[in-house]
């Protein structure tokens, strides 16, 4: 987790001169509980919009918009904290917004927004605002959370944004598999514009399960720049067992920017169809 | 014009099935995370369930669990709710919403998360 552009943070707007500071997400009024505290956030919103850097870059940020309720509280905000957290890691990062004069009602509702939090592919979020200062111990919660998905670098969108592109995004292998006599299977995938080698995996399956029946990996070197967009063709021969027919072929790739975390591909072959109509039945069953 | 337009629903025995469906169009569909919210008769909105752009997640409310399926093709830009074991409490107004953003709302209140909403398709159960 991390912020975008450090510099540029401004959380002040007409009628409030306001700074955004780092915060250790333990703020100072859960030590020290005041005895008048605001109200919590109204209508919190998390979007993904997308921000360039200064250096040209496309990031994914999580965009946080919230409005303040129209109660006497007001009078004693002194700002809020911004908490994202990463779900599958705990990590969590927070901003302060220190509100550095009094807020007063005016004719239209309050409204903040921070759009600074980089948030990556395929990822969860719980984003939280807390009005400060934090309730006393057994105070009503003034603070609203949301939690929010980030499509991973399939989507279209999210596929042209740099934390993607560096992963492999714009790569599309069009992988075509068949299955050949004598127990052996054609893999063709377009090679990238990159001199880089490439891994197949194959993982089969019986019919209807999970557990994998036979698994092979085949390494494909590094193909020469004229050979770069072109097809590569790989004949896998398969093991021998019966009833061990769904294969998945999963391809990754080794580029520069993405070493050995690169985006991989797969394909999968089905089992072939089963007959609906069972054997017929001889009318009469010999003994011998 | 961007809408969504309901179908499916119906009158139906408790325990049986129902499928609705929902059309979009004005948008790319594959872009956005959608959603089922139902409304029952005299009472508020409640989430049903959502499913990511692509389908790779799909989540539901603990009263639908292991009856309900939603689904999606992005090739007919159209989702789908499998209903199944329909009890009378499932009888609602049923609504396909669009989520506002490129994310989905996986948690917390999200109602405020969809900009765009059906114009519902009514589900009675009863014997």
């Known amino acids: 987790l991390r912020l975008l552009d450090h510099r540029a943070l401004v959380c002040s707007q007409p009628g409030l001169n306001c700074t955004v500071k780092n915060s250790t997400c333990l703020d100072d009024s859960w030590i020290h509980p005041r005895n008048l505290t605001p109200s919590s956030p109204k209508d919190l919103q998390i979007q993904l919009h997308f921000a360039h850097t200064q250096q040209g870059d496309l990031f994914p940020v999580a965009h946080i918009e919230w409005t303040l309720q129209t109660d006497a509280s007001i009078l004693y905000l002194e700002g809020a904290e911004l908490s994202v957290l990463q779900l599958n890691t705990n990590e969590r990062l927070c901003v302060r917004f220190e509100f550095l004069s009094k807020l007063r009602h005016h004719h239209r509702r309050w409204r903040f927004t921070f759009s600074h939090f980089v948030v990556d592919p395929d990822q969860e979020y719980e984003v939280t605002v807390h009005h400060l200062p934090k309730p006393i111990p057994d105070g009503d919660p003034n603070h609203q959370s949301k939690n929010f998905l980030v499509p991973d670098c399939e989507h279209a969108r999210m596929k042209v944004t740099t934390p993607c592109m560096s992963s492999g995004s714009l790569w599309d292998p069009n992988i075509t598999v068949e299955t050949l006599e004598a127990h052996q299977l054609r893999v063709s995938f377009t090679l990238w514009n990159e001199s880089t080698h490439y891994q197949i995996l194959l993982t089969s399956f019986p019919h209807m399960e999970n557990h994998s029946c036979f698994e092979h990996m085949h390494h494909i070197p590094a193909p020469r720049p004229e050979e770069f967009h072109q097809r590569s063709n790989v004949t896998l021969t398969l093991r021998n067992l019966k009833g061990c027919c769904r294969h998945q072929v999963q391809i990754q790739p080794f580029f520069s920017s993405c070493l050995n975390d690169c985006l991989r591909h797969s394909a999968t072959v089905s089992c072939p169809e089963m007959p609906d109509t069972p054997e017929p039945i001889p009318d009469y069953m010999p003994l011998w | 014009e961007v809408q969504l337009v309901e179908s499916g629903g119906g009158l139906v025995q408790p325990g049986r099935s129902l499928r609705l469906s929902c059309a979009a169009s004005?948008?790319?569909?594959?872009?956005?995370?959608m959603h089922w919210v139902r409304q029952p008769p005299g009472k508020g909105l409640e989430w049903v369930s959502g499913i990511t752009w692509n389908g790779g997640r799909k989540d539901y409310a603990d009263s639908v669990k292991g009856r309900f399926t939603i689904s999606r093709d992005n090739a007919k830009n159209s989702l789908y709710l499998q209903m199944n074991s329909l009890r009378a409490e499932d009888a609602a107004l049923y609504y396909c919403v669009k989520e506002r953003s490129l994310g989905y709302c996986s948690g917390g209140s999200c109602s405020d998360a969809f900009d765009i909403w059906g114009q519902g398709t009514m589900v009675t159960v009863s014997s």
């Open positions: 004005g948008f790319s569909f594959d872009d956005y995370a």
